[in-house]
């Protein structure tokens, strides 16, 4: 028969206050005969946690039926855990002796520590929007976890990010800890529908990490491109001019038409469409009254996007009987 080994598989057991802790212990042999007792700590001052034969241990139950023959499982459960229960627990095999049993072999011990789950990560983006090709910072915070060891990762659309800095506080011993991480993200023009994810993994989460998200739509401003065109066909004494405002975000936009420098107050037809990438297109039509005697008309489409400086695009109508081709130029 093989020599008896005491197996305590977990080096560390994290428990939550009020819950039940299971301390595992198995033996590999029935011999030598003698009881298995549980202690907290080592040496003369160790505390007896469980002795099946004698004593009263109201919070302790055995996982297996110890009265079953050939039982090799001496695992115990301790209910209603409090902070006072932390420490290292040892299952100890005694062998028969006279007049008292003699300690024969101890398990390696299981350290019981109080574990606390981290709070759901909160991700905050920049206070102001930024245009593509620029870098923005996102912060992620989670609080109240223990022990201190924790893993935090950042993702953008499922791709892991590497440009971030993380701090866990406090640095010394504490009942609970907090984590704060700042990630730097370069914005792409198509990021309106992108997400950044902060993922926190902790031993108390049993392999199921917590995630906090932020939408880049809250952080990005995609400025529009403008194009003003004149429709080739003329309807009576009216020419249709189109201002196409493309690929902008957010939707907040003001468009005004000017005719030879005078802002036109009359209604114009327009449509707003959303692109697959989440940006918008705005098309505005402007009908210009022309006559054969009339000289050049300069039309300006001015766009103010999301409170930024206005941008405009001009179109000079060269109106002849034969309706010459239009030409255009842009002004900031």
């Amino acid at each position: 028969e093989e020599e008896l080994q005491m197996i305590q598989p977990e080096k560390l057991l994290l428990v939550t206050v009020g819950k039940t802790a299971t301390l595992h212990c198995t033996v590999t042999s029935l011999l030598p005969v003698g009881p298995v007792l549980w202690f907290r700590g080592v040496g003369p001052g160790r505390e007896l946690i469980y002795n099946q034969k004698e004593g009263h241990f109201p919070r302790v139950t055995t996982v297996s039926d110890l009265t079953k023959r050939n039982n090799m499982d001496f695992s115990i459960r301790i209910s209603s855990i409090t902070p006072a229960d932390v420490g290292t627990y040892y299952c100890v095999k005694f062998r028969k002796g006279s007049p008292e049993n003699v300690e024969f072999k101890s398990g390696p011990g299981t350290e019981m520590a109080l574990g606390a789950k981290p709070s759901a990560p909160v991700v905050l983006g920049p206070a102001a929007r930024t245009t593509p090709e620029h870098t923005v910072s996102f912060t992620c915070e989670s609080h109240g976890f223990s022990p201190r060891d924790i893993t935090l990762k950042w993702f953008k659309n499922g791709n892991e990010l590497s440009d971030f800095q993380t701090n866990v506080d406090p640095t010394g011993q504490s009942v609970a800890y907090s984590i704060r991480s700042t990630a730097r993200v370069v914005l792409d023009p198509w990021d309106v529908r992108s997400q950044v994810i902060c993922e926190v993994a902790h031993v108390t989460l049993q392999g199921d990490p917590l995630r906090g998200t932020a939408n880049l739509s809250e952080a990005i401003r995609v400025p529009p491109t403008l194009e003003v065109t004149q429709q080739p066909m003329r309807v009576g004494n009216q020419v249709n001019v189109t201002c196409q405002v493309r690929k902008f975000y957010p939707q907040s936009l003001q468009l005004t038409w000017s005719e030879n420098g005078n802002v036109c107050q009359r209604e114009t037809a327009s449509t707003l469409t959303e692109n697959k990438d989440g940006t918008y297109n705005w098309t505005s039509w402007f009908l210009v009254n022309i006559s054969d005697q009339r000289d050049d008309v300069v039309l300006t489409c001015q766009v103010k996007h999301d409170g930024q400086l206005a941008v405009s695009k001009r179109l000079a109508l060269e109106v002849t009987v034969h309706q010459k081709d239009q030409s255009s130029d842009a002004t900031p």
Partner: antibody, heavy 122, light 106 residues
């Protein structure tokens, strides 16, 4: 003071089933294993098997295929059935308590019944 | 499975010390129990846990176990001690008895 009282048929024909019952008086029934032991005439003790209050059983491998041990906790009784008896099963049959003081490493048989003589003869 | 070997008989004069041995594999790692059985009576446990006496058993009964041998010692043997003696241990989940020793008080 715990006492064990046993009874059952004393004379059997070959191939019949031996049936004995043991009642526990004056003590706890749960928390112990309860054994059956036999002693052929002029020979030593042979352990047959045991049962506890929850019905967990263990048997002598040489008899296991023919033995049934059952328990009736409402009456504080346990019973032995030995099938297909032969003359070799002629013996004094004892019921006994296994002291539970030192689980899981088993204890001695500290209380015994008075014994029942069973003879198998055609 | 484990076997326990006892001498078939031991003789002793009254007042002398009788020793009955029981040998078996790794007995020193197991607990050994001793029973006394007088003719026509049920066995009585006289030693448990190698060397401990149940209540009511005279002090002259003593037990020991080490290595592969257990010993029942009866000091100042009396005529009333004449009986069969059986050692017993456990092999896994099975009770194992020795073959028994007839103690004769001359």
């Amino acid at each position: 003071q715990v006492q064990l009282q046993q009874w059952g048929a004393g004379l059997l024909k070959p191939s019949e089933t031996l049936s004995l019952t043991c009642a526990v008086y004056g003590g706890s029934f749960s928390g112990y294993y309860w054994s059956w032991i036999r002693q052929p005439p002029g020979k030593g003790l042979e352990w047959i098997g045991e049962i506890n209050h929850s019905g967990s059983t263990n048997f002598n491998p040489s008899l296991k295929s023919r033995v049934t041990i059952s328990v009736d906790t409402s009456k504080n009784q346990f019973s032995l059935k030995l099938r297909s008896v032969t003359a070799a099963d002629t013996a004094v049959y004892y019921c006994s308590r296994v002291d539970s003081g030192s689980y899981p490493y088993y204890d001695g048989l500290d209380v015994w019944g008075q014994g029942t003589t069973v003879t198998v003869s055609s | 499975s484990s076997e326990l070997t006892q001498p078939p008989s031991v003789s002793v004069s009254p007042g002398q010390t009788a020793s009955i041995t029981c040998s078996g594999d790794k007995l020193g790692d197991k607990y050994v129990y001793w029973y006394q059985q007088k003719p026509g009576q049920s066995p009585v446990l006289v030693i448990y846990h190698d060397d401990r006496r149940p209540a009511g058993i005279p002090e002259r009964f003593a037990g020991s176990a080490s290595g592969n041998t257990a010993t029942l010692t009866i000091s100042g043997t009396q005529a009333m001690d004449e009986a069969d003696y059986y050692c017993q241990t456990w092999d896994s989940s099975t009770v194992v008895f020795g073959g028994g020793t007839k103690l004769t008080v001359l």
